[in-house]
Amino acid sequence: QGGTRSPRCDCAGDFHKKIGLFCCRGCPAGHYLKAPCTEPCGNSTCLVCPQDTFLAWENHHNSECARCQACDEQASQVALENCSAVADTRCGCKPGWFVECQVSQCVSSSPFYCQPCLDCGALHRHTRLLCSRRDTDCGTCLPGFYEHGDGCVSCPTSTLGSCPERCAAVCGWRQMF
């Protein structure tokens, strides 16, 4: 006498499940269950999710909608897509910033903060890969600049300064004494 048998709902269409006393049709995405149906294979009473709440899937049992997430301003996040009745807010980074995950195994739901992208131009370097999901990848020095240490140094404008080997190769002339 376990009472664990869950009778199959034999209704036209497959989106029926026993809720309350009968097999009822579930609520569509963006709606919550106000009251179950009161007849076999009937329609539940479903209401639209109130503002700032959502339900992304068809559901049988949700009697309230989930609260929309607020993007974390402290982490410099912005809303890429506003919350709707059927989808949560999509948070991301504004143009010129990239996502830095706060956990090592990064998935779409992982906590993150936004970091400003490197400005390759300000470093006098070519932009090899634009910043989006990761930081900008800067390439070689721009014309008129040569590699020196970790940075790009401007080619000398006169012949008075010393121009090392690399400078000469890039800047196009060798310093003569």
Partner: antibody, heavy 120, light 111 residues
Framework: EVKLVESGGGLVKPGGSLKLSCSAS????????MSWVRQTPEKRLEWVAA???????FYPDSLKGRFTISRDNARNTLYLQMSSLGSEDTALYCC??????????????WGQGTSVTVSS | DIVLAQSPASLLVSLGQRATISCRAS??????????MHWYQQKPGQPPKLLIY???NLESGVPARFSGSGSGTDFTLNIHPVEEEDAATYYC?????????FGAGTMLELK
């Protein structure tokens, strides 16, 4: 063995209140939908309220607001709180278990009932 | 609300004969391929006992001399051959919608 034992009935004055209990044993109470059904002195059966295993309550419109069904799964007990009682509520009140093979309300076990008399 | 009219109100049948009880609903209780009509037996001093569910399905432990038929608005409970222990009041009940309602009952007496 499935057993349903009602209690709490008695004589009550018009306008009064009463709370009935139904103690269940011999089955996994929390997995079953349960109902209260009353039998009038004329032997008519009237469905009074139901409480589904997933937590929903149901009443006929005529009794909504006056009667409240509740359940305590830890105590294996079904309750019926009745208020603003009138002579038309005089009956034998039975609790009944809904069949677990059914996704519609049909009652496969009934208690013996507890008698409620509303009279001044 | 769906009203269930049972007939006759009482029935006198000889042992071994057939008893036929009718239940007529004020609107169809059939939908989605099923007829949501059920039958109960109540003996004096006892609670009702489920006999038949969904118009024609015999509840476990109920003797095969009980049978049910019908669809839409008209349903029948048959007992054949009637035995002494079948003297009781028989009720139909629908679960086509809420509220659930019962017929007024048919009292079966033996000659």
């Amino acid at each position: 063995e499935v057993k349903l034992v009602e209690s709490g009935g008695g004589l009550v004055k018009p306008g009064g209140s009463l709370k009935l209990s139904c103690s269940a044993s011999g089955f996994a109470f929390s997995n079953y939908d349960m109902s209260w059904v009353r039998q009038t002195p004329e032997k008519r059966l009237e469905w009074v309220a139901a409480f589904s295993s997933d937590g929903y309550t149901f009443y006929p419109d005529s009794l909504k607001g006056r009667f409240t069904i509740s359940r305590d799964n830890a105590r294996n007990t079904l309750y019926l709180q009745m208020s603003s009682l009138g002579s038309e509520d005089t009956a034998l009140y039975c609790c009944a278990r809904h069949a677990d093979y059914a996704n519609y309300p049909v009652m496969d076990y009934w208690g013996q009932g507890t008698s409620v008399t509303v009279s001044s | 609300d769906i009203v269930l009219a049972q007939s006759p109100a009482s029935l006198l049948v000889s042992l071994g004969q057939r008893a036929t009880i009718s239940c007529r609903a004020s609107k169809s209780v059939s939908t989605s391929g099923y007829s949501y009509m059920h039958w109960y037996q109540q003996k004096p001093g006892q609670p009702p006992k489920l006999l038949i569910y969904l118009a024609s399905n015999l509840e476990s432990g109920v003797p095969a001399r009980f049978s049910g038929s019908g669809s839409g608005t008209d349903f029948t409970l048959n007992i054949h051959p009637v035995e002494e222990e079948d003297a009781a009041t028989y009720y139909c009940q629908h679960s086509r919608e809420l509220p659930l309602t019962f017929g007024a009952g048919t009292m079966l007496e033996l000659k």
